[in-house]
Interface confidence: medium
């Protein structure tokens, strides 16, 4: 083979092998979620997880997220707060 | 080296180099989230973000998502609406 | 070219080609979300999706997630339950 056609062949092979490795790796990425429930008006996600939603006791649907990790239920006298926590899982 | 064993060596090298690049790239992927709050009964996520949950004023827990980007709080006379917005961050 | 400099050239080419393939693949990863609404107090996400948040009828903001796939609204006499369901989309 000439160097030129060899270069083409190597390029093709890289595309093939790397492509299939990438496809397998990307396909295995998932979204891993868990719930954390705490007494009172605050619930904090584990390190490395992001808050995607919050739930509150007493039917309360008003909440905010503090420091990107903690659910805060805004209704008075909250008995419990829950955080829905997710992360990308390779 | 024969062309055949050279091909094998190249394949192995592709697996190694591509594998390490892929591992690095996949390992750095994270979930980035932010909150958007608006007056009224609608709150829209920035471009590129997906709605993962909504929150509403007046303790309201009833909402729906419009056009995959906007939180809509369903209770009457909503003073504010919040959207929890997330995206995969390379 | 010597085998040594050829090896270096191949390594460089793998880095280049695989690197750009990986960048494109990673850049195209997104968060795909959808809503599922059901009558009653339970709503289940499709296979492969994770629950990121829940919504309930009657303004109820109290919910929990069962088996990581199902939203359960906790207020009495729920007329409907909604699940916000997301997955990483290559």
């Amino acid at each position: 083979k000439t160097l030129c056609s060899m270069e083409e062949a190597i390029n093709e092979r890289i595309q093939e092998v790397a492509g299939s490795l990438i496809f397998r790796a990307i396909s295995s990425i998932g979204l891993e979620c868990q719930s954390v429930t705490s007494r009172g008006d605050l619930a904090t996600c584990p390190r490395g997880f992001a808050v995607t939603g919050c739930t509150c006791g007493s039917a309360c649907g008003s909440w905010d997220v503090r420091a990107e990790t903690t659910c805060h239920c805004q209704c008075a006298g909250m008995d419990w707060t829950g955080a829905r926590c997710c992360r990308v899982q390779p | 080296k024969t062309l055949c064993s050279m091909e094998e060596a190249i394949n192995e090298r592709i697996q190694e180099v591509a594998g390490s690049l892929i591992f690095r790239a996949i390992s750095s992927i994270g979930l980035e989230c932010q909150s958007v709050t608006s007056r009224g009964d609608l709150a829209t996520c920035p471009r590129g973000f997906a709605v993962t949950g909504c929150t509403c004023g007046s303790a309201c827990g009833s909402w729906d998502v419009r056009a995959e980007t906007t939180c809509h709080c369903q209770c009457a006379g909503m003073d504010w609406t919040g959207a929890r917005c997330c995206r995969v961050q390379p | 070219k010597t085998l040594c400099s050829m090896e270096e050239a191949i390594n460089e080419r793998i880095q280049e080609v695989a690197g750009s393939l990986i960048f494109r693949a990673i850049s195209s990863i997104g968060l795909e979300c959808q809503s599922v609404t059901s009558r009653g107090d339970l709503a289940t996400c499709p296979r492969g999706f994770a629950v990121t948040g829940c919504t309930c009828g009657s303004a109820c903001g109290s919910w929990d997630v069962r088996a990581e796939t199902t939203c359960h609204c906790q207020c009495a006499g729920m007329d409907w339950t909604g699940a916000r369901c997301c997955r990483v989309q290559p």
């Epitope: 490395g48 420091a67 | 390992s27 750095s28 980035e32 | -």
Partner: antibody
Framework: EVQLLESGGGLVQPGGSLRLSCAAS????????MSWVRQAPGKGLEWVSS????????NYADSVKGRFTISRDNSKNTLYLQMNSLRAEDTAVYYC?????????WGQGTLVTVSS | DIQMTQSPSSLSASVGDRVTITCRAS??????LNWYQQKPGKAPKLLIY???YLQSGVPSRFSGSGSGTDFTLTISSLQPEDFATYYC?????????FGQGTKVEIK
């Protein structure tokens, strides 16, 4: 060539404050998470804090949570660590490191001594 | 937090020796295991990431293996510049945690 240069270390009394800086060059700073790792004299390595590329997400070791604040200025290619309520056990060499998973590049370190 | 346990804590070896250091995680961390070399007064240097991937510029006498909870760093033929302290670190779960270190000394 990737370079990370820490500054701001020194001697401080217990309860005092210090602000460490890390000037980065040789890579696209705004595209990478960054971390602080410390090493007490004669001891092993301890992760302290990390911050995402955009600065929206931060993580802290339990031993420093509520006392230390990590931040970054992507326009200046600089990472910061604000350390308040310092204790004797915070005495260490503080390294800034690129990434928040495998730390592929490290600065030379800056010594923080907490003593009365 | 995940505990990382290295063994041995120190070892004596000669130039040319094959050296093996092990690291055990308190729970499975898949392949999220990194190895660093540190010389006195210097910053650590990444040798291996992802359990087995050689960091750019690191000599091929260094290799890593393992997955799950048990990992190994091998130096196939010890060189004078390899006498240092070696740390493993897991990056599978926050917070990142390091092993206590293994000091490789001249026999």
């Amino acid at each position: 060539e990737v370079q990370l240069l820490e500054s701001g270390g020194g001697l401080v009394q217990p309860g005092g404050s210090l602000r460490l800086s890390c000037a980065a060059s040789g890579f696209t700073f705004s595209s990478y998470a960054m971390s602080w790792v410390r090493q007490a004299p004669g001891k092993g390595l301890e992760w302290v804090s990390s911050i995402s590329a955009s600065g929206t997400s931060t993580n802290y070791a339990d031993s420093v949570k509520g006392r230390f604040t990590i931040s970054r200025d992507n326009s200046k290619n600089t990472l910061y660590l604000q350390m308040n309520s310092l204790r004797a056990e915070d005495t260490a060499v503080y390294y800034c490191a690129k990434s928040n998973s495998d730390f592929d590049y490290w600065g030379q370190g800056t010594l923080v001594t907490v003593s009365s | 937090d995940i505990q990382m346990t290295q063994s041995p804590s120190s070892l004596s070896a000669s130039v040319g020796d094959r050296v093996t250091i092990t690291c055990r995680a308190s729970q499975s961390i898949s392949s999220y295991l990194n190895w660093y070399q540190q010389k006195p007064g210097k910053a650590p240097k990444l040798l291996i990431y992802g359990a087995s991937y050689l960091q750019s510029g690191v000599p091929s006498r260094f290799s890593g293996s393992g997955s799950g909870t048990d990992f190994t760093l091998t130096i196939s033929s010890l060189q004078p510049e390899d006498f240092a302290t070696y740390y493993c670190q897991q990056s599978g779960y926050d917070p990142a945690t390091f092993g206590q270190g293994t000091k490789v000394e001249i026999k």
